[in-house]
């Protein structure tokens, strides 16, 4: 089943640099998370998993690439701006925010190698540094001096 | 043997909200993201969105955002698919449909539920 | 979004005849691409993906060809119980689009 063509750089190439080049600028999701303001999805619930459980909850967004390793990544998107209070589960906290925390994921990505005298050899991969939001963190505001 | 039940035919008020359940047999169902089709007047197919039973992890087409809302209850085995604020324009007939994969280059939807028809009149 | 384009939209050809039906993505898609099969009144089934690959139990008369932009799915030898609509689908990005379906008739 599997389509990916095997890597083949081309011969005298050093393999490990061939395949995996290091990138250190992380790639930013495709798109800023902006808190949900519906209200009705803005609520810690007192069961399932943990991101629905939080005073900062959140879902997850899918982000498909078919030319990258993983091919799915999940971003994870705040549902509420403030944190919701832990007595009710509802009522938004203005004293606390809501904020995504990130993290640098390695990736692989499938590019198209290329031999002596340009010619195409097949897929190499390439490693990079992917920003992936993992989760809503409830934290006090930055206080501006 | 793969199957996926939805619930049956709705007819619904313009305005108001509904819920069509998808219950899945034959699997893993945290395994697999289950994706959701739109076919109006037995013609067109629109994909409408799809979500992962294992996180709760979701994609829409950017047409149903607002009007439509993916969830699971990974306890029963079901997905689910919420339709809002519903108009003349929804009437159609809705598919789940499982995401078939190998883990590389091949996303398809392999098993199909039976569909559910939605009228929407007053 | 990727626009799908398929031609014909409707045809009519005799048992035993070969037919083709192709697809045109608006962007090159590499070879994702999914055949789907919908007889009258039932429901959509895989037939082929990822361009040529047939899905389990799929009759060896149906096949699928292409790379890029332009797609074909190839009926060697038409039989009775193959009168349906075919629709493409490309999975390159998301969203997810199809074709907008070629009904397929005996003559």
């Known amino acids: 089943y599997s389509h990916w063509p095997s890597c083949c750089p081309s011969k005298g190439q050093d393999t490990s640099e061939e395949l995996l080049r290091w990138s250190t600028v992380p790639v930013p999701p495709l798109e800023p998370a902006r808190p949900n303001r519906h209200p009705e999805s803005c609520r810690a619930s007192e069961d399932g998993p943990l991101n629905s459980r939080a005073i900062s909850p959140w879902r997850y967004e899918l982000d498909r690439d078919l030319n990258r390793l993983p091919q799915d990544l999940y971003h994870a998107r705040c549902l509420c701006p403030h944190c919701v209070s832990l007595q009710t589960g509802s009522h938004m906290d203005p004293r606390g925010n809501s904020e995504l925390l990130y993290h640098n994921q390695t990736v692989f990505y499938r590019r198209p190698c290329h031999g002596e005298k340009g010619t195409h050899k097949g897929y190499c991969l390439e490693r990079r540094l992917y920003r992936v939001s993992l989760a809503c963190v409830c934290v006090r505001p930055r206080v501006m001096g | 043997e793969v199957q996926l039940q939805q619930s049956g035919p709705e007819l619904v008020k313009p305005g108001a909200s509904m819920k069509i359940s998808c219950k899945a047999s034959?699997?893993?169902?945290?395994?697999?993201?289950m994706n959701w089709v739109k076919q109006s007047h037995g013609k067109n197919l629109e994909w409408i969105g799809l979500?992962?039973?294992?996180?709760?992890?979701?994609s829409y087409n950017q047409n149903f955002k607002g009007k439509a809302t993916l969830t699971v209850d990974k306890s029963s085995s079901t997905a689910y698919m919420e339709l809002l604020s519903l108009t003349s324009e929804d009437s159609a007939v809705y598919y789940c449909?499982?995401?078939?994969?190998?883990?590389?280059?091949?996303?398809?939807?392999?098993?199909w539920g039976q569909g559910t028809s939605v009228t929407v009149s007053s | 979004d990727i626009q799908m384009t398929q031609s014909p939209s409707s045809l009519s050809a005799s048992v035993g005849d070969r037919v083709t039906i192709t697809c045109s993505a608006s962007?090159?898609?590499?070879?994702?691409l999914n055949w789907y099969q919908q007889k009258p009144g039932k429901v959509p089934k895989l037939l082929i993906y990822?361009?040529?690959s047939l899905h389990s139990g799929v009759p060896s008369r149906f096949s699928g060809s292409g790379s890029g932009t332009d797609f074909t799915l190839t009926i060697s030898s038409l039989q009775p119980e193959d009168v349906a609509t075919y629709y493409c689908?490309?999975?390159?990005?998301?969203?997810?689009?199809f074709g907008q379906g070629t009904k397929l008739e005996i003559k």
């Open positions: 979500i992962n039973p294992y996180n709760g992890g979701t």
């Open positions: 449909a499982r995401e078939g994969y190998d883990g590389y280059l091949y996303f398809a939807m392999d098993y």
């Open positions: 962007q090159g898609i590499s070879n994702y």
């Open positions: 990822y361009t040529s």
């Open positions: 689908q490309q999975y390159s990005k998301l969203p997810y689009t």
């Open positions: 034959g699997y893993s169902f945290t395994d697999y993201t």
